[in-house]
Amino acid sequence: EICGPGIDIRNDYQQLKRLENCTVIEGYLHILLISKAEDYRSYRFPKLTVITEYLLLFRVAGLESLGDLFPNLTVIRGWKLFYNYALVIFEMTNLKDIGLYNLRNITRGAIRIEKNADLCYLSTVDWSLILDAVSNNYIVGNKPPKECGDLCPGTMEEKPMCEKTTINNEYNYRCWTTNRCQKMCPSTCGKRACTENNECCHPECLGSCSAPDNDTACVACRHYYYAGVCVPACPPNTYRFEGWRCVDRDFCANILSAESSDSEGFVIHDGECMQECPSGFIRNGSQSMYCIPCEGPCPKVCEEEKKTKTIDSVTSAQMLQGCTIFKGNLLINIRRGNNIASELENFMGLIEVVTGYVKIRHSHALVSLSFLKNLRLILGEEQLEGNYSFYVLDNQNLQQLWDWDHRNLTIKAGKMYFAFNPKLCVSEIYRMEEVTGTKGRQSKGDINTRNNGERASCESDVLHFTSTTTSKNRIIITWHRYRPPDYRDLISFTVYYKEAPFKNVTEYDGQDACGSNSWNMVDVDLPPNKDVEPGILLHGLKPWTQYAVYVKAVTLTMVENDHIRGAKSEILYIRTNASVPSIPLDVLSASNSSSQLIVKWNPPSLPNGNLSYYIVRWQRQPQDGYLYRHNYCSKDKIPIRKYADGTIDIEEVTENPKTEVCGGEKGPCCACPKTEAEKQAEKEEAEYRKVFENFLHNSIFVPRPE
């Protein structure tokens, strides 16, 4: 029987009974948070052979081996992964061995086995026989191998029963437990699976089979399962489902979901039965099972039950992620927040249409409304008292509505209202009237000319740059000295700059009133000499990178209740010079004949310009005499070389650091201090562990029901 779509067993070990009749778990299997040590010996699920997603074990007290629970688990497909992993064993306090002696294939994803204080038989498993690539495996913080004394079956009696393979230059027996070898197929089978009797399975089988060369006798399928047969692709009029089987249209149409989007059911797209159309596609009609490409961003209609959606935090904005049409009214009331402008853009930036009104009040954290970067239509089907469909009241730091040179916004019905926005220039409001087609709708009191913009320098003069000079990591710019009517009103200049790969940035990008700003800022004092033009040297820049730069004059904003003129420049785009590229990455060389070497590499992470060619240099090296110095047939004469495995746990390094032999006659000496690169790698490693642990906790801990 197929079970699914993912099974979560927690708190009570008796929930394991849910696995009783499962042969395939279509989805994941979580076994976690069972804090009372139980006797699991009476629980055995020999029917279970395949998990299509991943297996996660976390804090299950009393469980000592998985072999008794899942003696026939053969394949974990990894169709969906848990943080890139198909097998996660984390903080299993009593687990002594993994013991999944029939596990032959993890189709996709890596394994993470971490913080299992009692877990042994890890170095005796050759994961390369199970996974395609072992480089992403993370096996850290388990019982130190020295304390394990792992012995494979028959080793003590000097009648070893298991086969040997090489891992990290160590040729050794491979087993899961003290009495279970790791199964290996004859080399004649190549990539194919094999039976218990070492006969090769059909090429479409994965993991194992009950009879040789028979596509109906597979334990699991390499590609897809359909009507009892393993097939390379789904037959006509059937569709891939969950990455492992073929289903017909009727099956797909009859899948019921508990997701909020289920009103329309599953779809068929690109030969697959899936829950929703993929990114960039939309259903071809509301009850259709088929997808067509969207023109531009895909429409997503979002509706608020209470008609008015209040955006007072990032969390409330999150509910609108992906929405393009909002049915209802938006009330924006953002008083504080961290990195608020870019967060709001992330969650509300796709909204194109609001059917009701938009009201922005007491939003002291906002400097601009540019986070609504795709808003093009306010229908005004519902209006505020007084027939307002755009209402902006008491926003202490609001300076810009939108960049009207690049913005088309129509307000179909209703008026606009603006009051008590001290940094919002009236000229900006008048410009909005023109663009939105609301000019003439507003009465005199709707746009208050006294309390809008009274704390801003609204009539801006333009500062002109006079010179720019660049090097690989510096830009020198100068600009005309600004002369307001009264020179005492000019305090200083502020230069704003940031990386800008494209020439599409605006002054208010990523800026909010709570300190977040995507621009770097530098203050420039007035030159004491009146004839010298002000300027700045921007240093520490990246080579061959385009920067956007603009300058603002810092002026006194009030002179006896008159608005005074400010000044700022246009945004200037300027690219630093090219420089030497960083080194090419991942250089690998291999010989494919007695006279040829194949060398491969990846481009440098920092090209610092346009790469035009690579220079490859090589030279002949003398043979290493070290190879001839020892009699390799005499076991005790082989020099002991330690190979770093890159995952040394701090607590596992117990040797005295003064025991390394430094070669020659020097005798013992201290371990070398860690290089900056090693320290950085250790720091990143610790950070990576933390990130994973946070992900794990966030994924599996859910609040208790009330």
Epitope: G4, S257, E259, S260
Partner: nanobody, 123 residues
Framework: EVQLVESGGGLVQPGGSLRLSCAAS????????MSWFRQAPGKEREFVSA????????RYADSVKGRFTISRDNSKNTLYLQMNSLRAEDTAVYYC????????????????WGQGTLVTVSS
Amino acid sequence: EVQLVESGGGLVQPGGSLRLSCAASGRTFSSFVMSWFRQAPGKEREFVSAISGSGSRFRYADSVKGRFTISRDNSKNTLYLQMNSLRAEDTAVYYCAANPRRATPDLQQYAYWGQGTLVTVSS
């Protein structure tokens, strides 16, 4: 953990009607696909009907199509089965079942089950 309790079973004459209820507690009710299964004496358990989390989509076994109606009230955490035109072959213990996220047409192993309520159709 989800607890399911069925009610509404009883003795009814052929052609009569009955309404079964299933009260759920323990987790967000709307995040489960809900189903009715039944088991007649000496027979295998069989699927009767299922409903999506929002209550907008349903599925019925051919044997009950047009006679039974499944519904749910997410505000009351309750699943219903309205059974009309009852026949003798509808006699069985009716079980309510819940599965998180989704349910495929071939799914028999639901995550959570009720204890069942007996429906007897007899003259």
